[in-house]
Protein backbone atom coordinates (compact mmCIF):
# COMPACT_ATOMS: atom_id res chain seq x y z
CA UNK A 1 0.00 0.00 0.00
CA UNK A 2 2.97 2.14 1.18
CA UNK A 3 4.60 1.54 -2.55
CA UNK A 4 1.39 1.84 -4.62
CA UNK A 5 0.83 4.93 -2.44
CA UNK A 6 4.09 6.51 -3.34
CA UNK A 7 3.93 5.39 -7.16
CA UNK A 8 0.67 7.51 -7.18
CA UNK A 9 1.84 10.65 -5.17
CA UNK A 10 2.05 13.60 -8.15
CA UNK A 11 4.83 15.19 -5.48
CA UNK A 12 7.28 12.69 -6.59
CA UNK A 13 7.16 13.43 -10.20
CA UNK A 14 8.51 17.15 -8.96
CA UNK A 15 12.13 17.60 -10.11
CA UNK A 16 15.02 19.43 -7.92
CA UNK A 17 14.33 23.47 -8.11
CA UNK A 18 10.85 22.56 -7.79
CA UNK A 19 8.58 21.73 -5.37
CA UNK A 20 5.02 20.29 -5.39
CA UNK A 21 2.30 23.29 -4.53
CA UNK A 22 -0.44 22.00 -2.43
CA UNK A 23 -1.92 25.18 -2.77
CA UNK A 24 -1.89 24.44 -6.81
CA UNK A 25 -3.53 20.95 -6.87
CA UNK A 26 0.05 19.40 -6.28
CA UNK A 27 1.65 21.33 -9.52
CA UNK A 28 5.33 21.26 -9.63
CA UNK A 29 6.46 25.26 -9.26
CA UNK A 30 9.90 26.60 -9.10
CA UNK A 31 11.37 27.59 -6.34
CA UNK A 32 10.97 31.13 -5.72
CA UNK A 33 13.76 33.61 -5.66
CA UNK A 34 16.42 33.06 -3.03
CA UNK A 35 15.43 29.72 -2.19
CA UNK A 36 15.67 26.04 -3.38
CA UNK A 37 15.42 22.44 -3.11
CA UNK A 38 18.74 20.02 -3.76
CA UNK A 39 15.91 16.72 -4.06
CA UNK A 40 12.84 15.78 -5.95
CA UNK A 41 9.50 15.44 -4.11
CA UNK A 42 9.84 18.07 -1.86
CA UNK A 43 6.97 20.02 -0.57
CA UNK A 44 8.73 23.29 0.14
CA UNK A 45 12.03 25.02 -1.29
CA UNK A 46 14.65 25.92 1.60
CA UNK A 47 15.82 29.12 2.27
CA UNK A 48 18.89 30.39 0.76
CA UNK A 49 22.01 30.99 2.98
CA UNK A 50 23.21 34.28 3.11
CA UNK A 51 26.61 35.71 3.36
CA UNK A 52 27.15 39.08 4.34
CA UNK A 53 29.91 40.77 6.42
CA UNK A 54 32.76 38.64 7.53
CA UNK A 55 31.24 36.44 5.35
CA UNK A 56 31.73 36.41 1.12
CA UNK A 57 29.79 34.42 -1.34
CA UNK A 58 32.24 31.46 -2.44
CA UNK A 59 29.19 29.88 -4.34
CA UNK A 60 25.79 31.61 -5.26
CA UNK A 61 22.87 29.82 -4.25
CA UNK A 62 20.99 28.67 -7.45
CA UNK A 63 17.33 26.73 -7.82
CA UNK A 64 19.07 23.33 -7.18
CA UNK A 65 21.95 24.17 -4.61
CA UNK A 66 22.55 26.27 -1.44
CA UNK A 67 24.98 29.26 -1.37
CA UNK A 68 28.38 28.81 -0.15
CA UNK A 69 30.03 31.26 2.09
CA UNK A 70 33.77 31.11 2.71
CA UNK A 71 35.46 34.47 4.81
CA UNK A 72 36.74 37.37 3.47
CA UNK A 73 40.29 38.08 3.14
CA UNK A 74 42.27 38.26 6.57
CA UNK A 75 40.43 35.70 7.77
CA UNK A 76 39.71 31.78 7.57
CA UNK A 77 36.92 29.40 8.73
CA UNK A 78 35.75 27.38 11.67
CA UNK A 79 33.57 24.76 11.84
CA UNK A 80 31.86 22.89 9.22
CA UNK A 81 30.42 24.67 6.67
CA UNK A 82 32.44 28.11 7.82
CA UNK A 83 29.67 28.95 10.52
CA UNK A 84 32.40 31.48 11.94
CA UNK A 85 35.43 33.45 10.89
CA UNK A 86 38.70 34.18 12.76
CA UNK A 87 41.32 36.75 11.82
CA UNK A 88 44.71 34.98 10.60
CA UNK A 89 47.97 35.63 11.71
CA UNK A 90 50.95 35.55 9.93
CA UNK A 91 52.97 32.60 10.45
CA UNK A 92 55.24 32.27 13.46
CA UNK A 93 52.37 33.64 15.56
CA UNK A 94 49.06 32.50 17.06
CA UNK A 95 45.45 34.45 17.68
CA UNK A 96 45.06 35.31 21.45
CA UNK A 97 42.51 37.35 22.89
CA UNK A 98 45.07 40.43 23.09
CA UNK A 99 45.46 39.21 19.16
CA UNK A 100 48.22 38.05 17.35
CA UNK A 101 51.50 37.38 18.77
CA UNK A 102 54.73 35.68 18.46
CA UNK A 103 55.27 31.92 18.88
CA UNK A 104 57.22 32.05 22.12
CA UNK A 105 60.93 29.86 22.24
CA UNK A 106 60.24 26.60 21.51
CA UNK A 107 57.80 26.79 19.81
CA UNK A 108 56.43 27.03 16.25
CA UNK A 109 53.27 28.30 13.57
CA UNK A 110 53.84 27.57 10.19
CA UNK A 111 50.51 28.47 9.07
CA UNK A 112 48.23 31.45 9.63
CA UNK A 113 45.95 29.86 12.06
CA UNK A 114 45.97 27.70 15.03
CA UNK A 115 48.46 27.94 18.10
CA UNK A 116 52.12 27.74 18.65
CA UNK A 117 53.31 23.80 19.04
CA UNK A 118 56.55 22.82 20.77
CA UNK A 119 59.29 22.11 18.52
CA UNK A 120 60.03 17.97 18.13
CA UNK A 121 62.12 16.70 21.15
CA UNK A 122 64.78 14.98 18.47
CA UNK A 123 66.54 13.56 21.56
CA UNK A 124 63.06 11.74 22.52
CA UNK A 125 63.97 9.77 19.39
CA UNK A 126 67.87 9.11 19.44
CA UNK A 127 68.04 11.67 17.00
CA UNK A 128 70.63 14.89 16.72
CA UNK A 129 69.11 19.02 15.91
CA UNK A 130 69.96 18.71 11.86
CA UNK A 131 68.52 22.17 11.65
CA UNK A 132 67.67 24.59 14.40
CA UNK A 133 63.87 25.66 14.47
CA UNK A 134 62.30 29.17 14.21
CA UNK A 135 58.85 30.33 15.04
CA UNK A 136 57.79 29.59 11.99
CA UNK A 137 59.80 26.02 11.13
CA UNK A 138 59.70 23.00 13.63
CA UNK A 139 63.51 21.56 14.33
CA UNK A 140 64.78 19.19 11.70
CA UNK A 141 66.31 15.64 13.41
CA UNK A 142 69.33 14.06 12.09
CA UNK A 143 70.77 11.03 12.40
CA UNK A 144 71.76 10.15 15.56
CA UNK A 145 74.59 11.23 17.61
CA UNK A 146 76.03 7.59 17.29
CA UNK A 147 75.94 7.37 13.47
CA UNK A 148 77.86 10.48 13.32
CA UNK A 149 81.03 9.05 14.79
CA UNK A 150 83.89 8.80 12.64
CA UNK A 151 83.90 6.55 9.76
CA UNK A 152 79.72 7.07 9.50
CA UNK A 153 78.30 7.91 6.82
CA UNK A 154 76.07 11.40 7.49
CA UNK A 155 74.80 11.61 3.88
CA UNK A 156 71.89 9.92 3.04
CA UNK A 157 71.68 8.08 -0.40
CA UNK A 158 69.55 9.69 -2.93
CA UNK A 159 66.18 8.72 -3.50
CA UNK A 160 65.46 6.32 -6.22
CA UNK A 161 64.50 8.37 -9.55
CA UNK A 162 61.15 8.24 -10.79
CA UNK A 163 59.33 7.96 -13.50
CA UNK A 164 58.33 11.35 -15.34
CA UNK A 165 54.68 12.01 -15.16
CA UNK A 166 54.26 10.44 -11.61
CA UNK A 167 54.04 12.02 -8.69
CA UNK A 168 54.15 10.89 -5.34
CA UNK A 169 51.48 9.19 -3.67
CA UNK B 1 42.55 42.91 23.98
CA UNK B 2 38.89 42.85 22.21
CA UNK B 3 36.51 45.38 23.76
CA UNK B 4 33.21 47.04 22.90
CA UNK B 5 31.70 49.39 25.35
CA UNK B 6 28.06 51.25 24.60
CA UNK B 7 27.29 54.33 25.83
CA UNK B 8 24.15 57.27 25.77
CA UNK B 9 21.47 58.54 27.23
CA UNK B 10 19.87 56.21 29.73
CA UNK B 11 16.39 58.26 29.23
CA UNK B 12 14.54 59.49 25.89
CA UNK B 13 11.78 61.03 26.05
CA UNK B 14 8.60 59.41 23.57
CA UNK B 15 9.03 60.48 19.80
CA UNK B 16 12.68 61.73 20.06
CA UNK B 17 15.54 59.64 18.79
CA UNK B 18 17.87 57.49 21.03
CA UNK B 19 21.69 57.51 20.19
CA UNK B 20 24.37 55.53 20.98
CA UNK B 21 27.78 54.58 20.64
CA UNK B 22 29.78 51.82 20.71
CA UNK B 23 33.42 52.25 21.03
CA UNK B 24 36.01 49.27 20.21
CA UNK B 25 39.24 48.93 20.77
CA UNK B 26 41.54 45.62 20.08
CA UNK B 27 40.09 45.46 16.49
CA UNK B 28 40.40 47.61 13.31
CA UNK B 29 36.75 49.15 12.46
CA UNK B 30 38.35 48.66 8.40
CA UNK B 31 38.53 45.10 9.17
CA UNK B 32 35.35 44.18 11.46
CA UNK B 33 32.13 45.44 11.14
CA UNK B 34 29.58 45.58 14.25
CA UNK B 35 25.72 44.21 14.91
CA UNK B 36 23.18 46.32 17.05
CA UNK B 37 21.10 43.85 19.05
CA UNK B 38 18.51 44.88 21.77
CA UNK B 39 16.74 43.20 24.84
CA UNK B 40 13.79 44.75 26.47
CA UNK B 41 13.61 43.78 30.28
CA UNK B 42 13.15 40.12 30.91
CA UNK B 43 12.35 39.24 27.69
CA UNK B 44 15.09 37.73 24.66
CA UNK B 45 17.30 39.15 21.66
CA UNK B 46 16.72 41.41 19.43
CA UNK B 47 18.68 41.76 15.91
CA UNK B 48 18.74 45.36 15.09
CA UNK B 49 20.93 45.79 12.02
CA UNK B 50 24.62 45.61 11.10
CA UNK B 51 27.27 47.82 9.37
CA UNK B 52 29.83 45.74 7.73
CA UNK B 53 33.84 46.75 7.11
CA UNK B 54 32.94 48.33 4.21
CA UNK B 55 30.21 50.46 5.76
CA UNK B 56 27.44 49.21 4.02
CA UNK B 57 24.15 48.32 6.51
CA UNK B 58 21.56 45.25 6.62
CA UNK B 59 18.64 45.90 9.25
CA UNK B 60 15.74 44.17 10.81
CA UNK B 61 12.74 45.29 8.45
CA UNK B 62 10.89 45.50 11.94
CA UNK B 63 13.09 48.97 12.08
CA UNK B 64 14.17 49.82 9.31
CA UNK B 65 11.77 52.66 8.54
CA UNK B 66 13.55 54.61 11.79
CA UNK B 67 17.05 52.99 12.16
CA UNK B 68 20.34 54.62 11.04
CA UNK B 69 23.92 52.56 11.98
CA UNK B 70 26.82 54.42 10.97
CA UNK B 71 30.46 54.18 11.98
CA UNK B 72 33.30 56.87 12.37
CA UNK B 73 36.58 55.27 12.01
CA UNK B 74 38.45 58.28 13.16
CA UNK B 75 36.96 57.82 16.76
CA UNK B 76 36.72 53.93 16.42
CA UNK B 77 33.20 54.65 17.71
CA UNK B 78 30.03 52.76 15.45
CA UNK B 79 26.83 54.91 16.49
CA UNK B 80 23.08 53.55 16.41
CA UNK B 81 20.46 55.85 15.73
CA UNK B 82 16.50 55.25 16.28
CA UNK B 83 13.81 57.85 15.56
CA UNK B 84 10.23 57.72 17.11
CA UNK B 85 10.57 56.00 19.87
CA UNK B 86 8.40 54.92 22.04
CA UNK B 87 7.98 52.92 25.74
CA UNK B 88 8.26 49.48 23.96
CA UNK B 89 11.62 50.48 22.67
CA UNK B 90 13.05 50.55 26.19
CA UNK B 91 15.83 47.71 26.57
CA UNK B 92 19.30 46.87 27.22
CA UNK B 93 20.86 47.91 23.78
CA UNK B 94 24.13 45.97 23.37
CA UNK B 95 26.36 46.00 20.24
CA UNK B 96 28.51 42.85 19.25
CA UNK B 97 32.08 42.30 16.40
CA UNK B 98 30.83 40.22 13.60
CA UNK B 99 32.26 37.18 13.25
CA UNK B 100 30.04 35.08 12.19
CA UNK B 101 28.57 34.01 15.90
CA UNK B 102 28.83 36.75 17.95
CA UNK B 103 32.02 36.12 20.00
CA UNK B 104 32.22 39.40 21.28
CA UNK B 105 29.83 41.76 23.08
CA UNK B 106 29.81 45.10 24.86
CA UNK B 107 28.42 45.20 27.89
CA UNK B 108 24.83 46.38 27.08
CA UNK B 109 23.79 49.92 28.18
CA UNK B 110 20.11 50.46 29.51
CA UNK B 111 17.82 52.74 27.40
CA UNK B 112 14.54 54.01 29.13
CA UNK B 113 11.95 55.44 27.31
CA UNK B 114 9.92 57.86 29.03
CA UNK B 115 8.26 61.03 29.99
CA UNK C 1 11.76 35.33 8.82
CA UNK C 2 13.24 32.41 10.52
CA UNK C 3 11.47 31.58 13.86
CA UNK C 4 13.41 29.52 16.64
CA UNK C 5 11.47 27.84 19.53
CA UNK C 6 13.15 26.90 22.42
CA UNK C 7 11.78 24.09 25.35
CA UNK C 8 11.15 24.20 27.86
CA UNK C 9 11.02 27.77 28.65
CA UNK C 10 12.25 26.88 32.24
CA UNK C 11 14.21 24.25 33.39
CA UNK C 12 14.46 23.24 37.19
CA UNK C 13 17.21 20.73 38.05
CA UNK C 14 20.47 20.12 40.58
CA UNK C 15 24.16 20.49 40.38
CA UNK C 16 25.78 17.49 38.95
CA UNK C 17 22.41 16.42 36.80
CA UNK C 18 22.16 16.27 33.29
CA UNK C 19 20.67 19.43 31.27
CA UNK C 20 19.01 18.93 27.64
CA UNK C 21 17.46 22.26 26.06
CA UNK C 22 16.04 22.12 22.63
CA UNK C 23 15.80 24.90 19.86
CA UNK C 24 13.87 24.37 16.65
CA UNK C 25 14.01 26.28 13.37
CA UNK C 26 11.40 27.46 11.38
CA UNK C 27 13.13 26.63 8.52
CA UNK C 28 15.58 24.49 7.99
CA UNK C 29 19.16 26.54 8.83
CA UNK C 30 21.40 23.60 8.37
CA UNK C 31 24.13 23.44 11.08
CA UNK C 32 24.23 27.73 11.53
CA UNK C 33 23.34 27.43 15.28
CA UNK C 34 25.03 29.48 17.92
CA UNK C 35 24.26 29.13 21.88
CA UNK C 36 24.26 31.96 24.55
CA UNK C 37 24.37 31.72 28.20
CA UNK C 38 23.42 34.89 29.76
CA UNK C 39 23.54 35.76 33.49
CA UNK C 40 21.65 38.90 35.20
CA UNK C 41 23.13 41.73 34.63
CA UNK C 42 25.76 40.46 31.66
CA UNK C 43 25.74 40.34 28.22
CA UNK C 44 25.14 36.94 26.69
CA UNK C 45 28.45 34.83 26.33
CA UNK C 46 29.54 31.98 23.06
CA UNK C 47 29.11 28.62 24.24
CA UNK C 48 28.38 26.89 20.98
CA UNK C 49 28.84 27.83 17.03
CA UNK C 50 27.93 26.11 14.21
CA UNK C 51 25.48 23.97 16.19
CA UNK C 52 28.38 21.50 17.48
CA UNK C 53 31.20 23.41 17.63
CA UNK C 54 32.80 24.93 20.81
CA UNK C 55 34.16 28.24 21.53
CA UNK C 56 37.19 28.96 22.85
CA UNK C 57 37.40 28.48 26.54
CA UNK C 58 34.18 27.16 26.82
CA UNK C 59 33.93 24.05 28.94
CA UNK C 60 33.63 20.46 27.38
CA UNK C 61 30.83 19.67 29.58
CA UNK C 62 28.70 21.78 27.32
CA UNK C 63 28.02 19.87 23.92
CA UNK C 64 25.83 20.73 20.94
CA UNK C 65 24.16 18.62 18.54
CA UNK C 66 21.28 18.91 15.71
CA UNK C 67 21.22 20.43 12.17
CA UNK C 68 18.45 21.21 9.77
CA UNK C 69 15.57 22.67 12.19
CA UNK C 70 16.42 20.42 15.61
CA UNK C 71 18.72 21.50 17.66
CA UNK C 72 20.25 20.58 21.10
CA UNK C 73 22.76 22.04 23.89
CA UNK C 74 23.16 19.44 26.14
CA UNK C 75 25.49 20.26 30.13
CA UNK C 76 26.50 16.91 30.83
CA UNK C 77 27.18 17.74 34.41
CA UNK C 78 25.46 20.80 36.07
CA UNK C 79 28.08 23.43 38.06
CA UNK C 80 26.48 25.92 40.19
CA UNK C 81 27.75 28.91 37.92
CA UNK C 82 26.05 26.77 35.21
CA UNK C 83 22.23 28.22 36.42
CA UNK C 84 21.29 31.28 33.81
CA UNK C 85 19.26 31.43 30.75
CA UNK C 86 20.62 29.90 27.72
CA UNK C 87 19.39 31.68 23.81
CA UNK C 88 19.65 29.73 20.51
CA UNK C 89 20.30 31.90 17.80
CA UNK C 90 20.64 31.39 13.73
CA UNK C 91 23.41 33.29 11.58
CA UNK C 92 21.95 31.57 8.54
CA UNK C 93 19.58 34.03 7.09
CA UNK C 94 18.61 37.56 7.74
CA UNK C 95 17.10 39.02 9.77
CA UNK C 96 18.96 37.46 12.47
CA UNK C 97 17.24 36.18 15.40
CA UNK C 98 17.38 34.41 18.38
CA UNK C 99 15.14 32.32 20.57
CA UNK C 100 12.77 33.21 23.41
CA UNK C 101 15.54 31.27 26.12
CA UNK C 102 15.58 28.98 28.34
CA UNK C 103 15.85 29.76 32.01
CA UNK C 104 17.70 26.73 33.74
CA UNK C 105 17.38 27.04 37.85
CA UNK C 106 18.07 25.37 40.85
CA UNK C 107 15.80 22.84 42.20
Known amino acids: FERTRSLQDPCSNCPAGTFCDNNRNQICSPCPPNSFSSAGGQRTCDICRQCKGVFRTRKECSSTSNAECDCTPGFHCLGAGCSMCEQDCKQGQELTKKGCKDCCFGTFNDQKRGICRPWTNCSLDGKSVLVNGTKERDVVCGPSPADLSPGASSVTPPAPAREPGHSPQ | QVQLQESGPGLVKPSETLSLTCTVS????????VHWIRQPPGKGLEWIGAIWSGGSTDYNAAFISRVTISVDTSKNQFSLKLSSVTAADTAVYYCARDDGSFANWGQGTLVTVSS | EIVLTQSPATLSLSPGERATLSCKASENVGTYVSWYQQKPGQAPRLLIY???NRYTGIPARFSGSGSGTDFTLTISSLEPEDFAVYYC?????????FGQGTRLEIK
Open chain 3, 89 to 97: GQTYSYPLT
Open chain 2, 26 to 33: GFSLTTYG
Open chain 3, 50 to 52: GAS
